[in-house]
């Protein structure tokens, strides 16, 4: 995403269509306070942040209201009037989703429906990961929907389960983020848990009759 | 399976003005997810991206040509049009409809017409 | 407008041969850049999209890689049919602009 004017790198992530997030690392200028300014319409006179990110005290970023914008971001960060980088951007390649929220989990002997609240925009998939202590991975399944059916589970194991949301990569692109992940719930036995155990218990050996 | 056939091209005056048309068939126009594009090619083969309708008939153009330009569709013909004015000579080139991957307007563009030569002078 | 070089302008190889095209972008494009096939009187035909991904029916001899400004379009064994110009093309910028051809002919 960062660009070659003048050294400057760029980064842009734009956080469940609503917000966008412009960072910058300029080495040229790592004591300068660069200015941020921007329009969502080509016609438009550039408007300047007022939503600053700093980093040593010094600007490195940008945070818009993006909701309900059009699709492009034209913007120029500057040193003085001096325009620095300049560039426009389909916000959407940049597409960070929320992270999952309301999740819940539904027992059913051997398996587990997990869901949450569907994001209100589509073509997205919604991926659970799950591992028990047995596990050197995490296993994972994703879906469409958040609604998703995990089988062939042991109901005697404790298991490790998060959340997150990808936007699929045929529609988006493939330079999106994927949503952080919700947090760690633990279950056994169709019970919440506050944690499993890292190392397995060892099974008990058969007493002999 | 998508085609895509341009006509309204030939000679035009300087000044002047020209409209062309996209038929598409195989393919509705209006499916959700797929933006059209007008992309033209000048005699020494350099591409320049016009401008896109989306299926929901939002649209986009280069800031180079946007004065100058509209792009429309009729959805009961499934095709779409490029008007064009104030035309110049360096606008001679020959111009194709296309149609962008699915996910929209940001892409690639999987499908093109044979395109329309454009002839700019008096 | 993001600037999009190809290199070489033209190329002249033989059947069989491995070639390899360049374009590089003026700014970072992450891996959003699209690869076209050009013959004499058609209309241009992608190849590759997303700096790596086969278009459908598009023979495996074609691959490409790159991310951020430097990618590279590769046929690793010249077919007569492979004889064109090829073009590349980046999308996240606004608008999408393309590079100015390789002319692929026959030595």
């Known amino acids: 995403q960062g660009g070659a004017a003048e050294g400057v790198q760029i980064q842009i992530i734009y956080f469940n269509l609503e917000t966008v997030q412009v960072t910058w690392n300029a080495s040229k200028y790592s004591r300068t306070n660069l200015t941020f300014h921007y329009r969502f319409n080509g016609d438009e006179a550039y408007d300047q942040c007022t939503n600053y990110l700093l980093q040593e005290g010094h600007t490195s970023g940008c945070l818009l209201d993006a909701e309900q914008r059009d699709d492009i971001l034209y913007f120029s960060i500057r040193n003085g009037t001096h325009p620095v980088f300049t560039a426009s951007r389909w916000m959407v390649y940049y597409l960070k989703p929320s992270s999952p929220k309301h999740v819940r989990f539904s027992w059913h002997q051997d398996a587990v429906t997990v869901t949450c609240s569907d994001l209100s925009y589509g073509d997205l998939l919604y991926e659970v990961q799950y591992r028990s202590p047995f596990d050197t991975e995490w296993q994972s399944k994703q879906e469409n929907t958040c609604n998703v059916t995990i089988e062939g589970l042991d109901a005697e194991k404790c298991y490790s389960f998060w959340v997150r949301v990808k936007a699929m990569e045929d529609v988006y692109g493939p330079d999106t983020y994927p949503s952080d992940w919700s947090e760690v719930t633990c279950w056994q036995r169709g019970e919440i848990r506050d944690a499993c155990a890292e190392t397995p218990t060892p099974p008990k050996p058969k007493l002999s009759k | 399976q998508v085609q895509l056939v341009e006509s309204g091209g030939g000679l035009v005056k300087p000044g002047g003005s020209l409209r062309l048309s996209c038929a598409a068939s195989?393919?509705?126009?209006?499916?959700?997810?797929?933006?059209w594009t007008w992309i033209r090619q000048f005699p020494g083969k350099g591409l320049e991206w016009m401008g896109y309708?989306?299926?929901?008939?939002?649209?986009y153009y280069n800031p180079a040509l946007k004065s100058r330009i509209t792009i429309s569709r009729d959805n009961a013909k499934n095709s779409l049009y490029l008007q064009m004015n104030s035309l110049r000579a360096e606008d001679t080139a020959v111009y194709y409809c296309?149609?962008?991957?699915?996910?929209?307007?940001?892409?690639?563009?999987?499908?093109w017409g044979q395109g329309t030569l454009v002839t700019v002078s008096s | 407008d993001i600037q999009m070089t190809q290199s070489p302008s033209s190329l002249s190889a033989s059947v069989g041969d491995r070639v390899t095209i360049t374009c590089r972008a003026s700014?970072?494009?992450?891996?959003?850049l699209h690869w076209y096939q050009q013959k004499p009187g058609k209309a241009p035909k992608l190849l590759i999209k997303?700096?790596?991904r086969l278009q459908s029916g598009v023979p495996s001899r074609f691959s490409g890689s790159g991310s951020g400004t430097d990618f590279t379009l590769t046929i690793s064994s010249l077919q007569p049919e492979d004889f064109a110009t090829y073009y590349c093309?980046?999308?996240?910028?606004?608008?999408?602009?393309f590079g100015q051809g390789t002319k692929l002919e026959i030595k």
């Open positions: 700014q970072s494009i992450g891996t959003s």
């Open positions: 997303f700096a790596s």
């Open positions: 296309a149609r962008s991957l699915y996910g929209g307007y940001k892409d690639a563009f999987d499908s």
């Open positions: 093309q980046q999308s996240p910028g606004f608008p999408p602009t």
């Open positions: 309708i989306g299926y929901n008939s939002k649209t």
């Open positions: 195989g393919f509705s126009i209006t499916t959700s997810g797929y933006y």
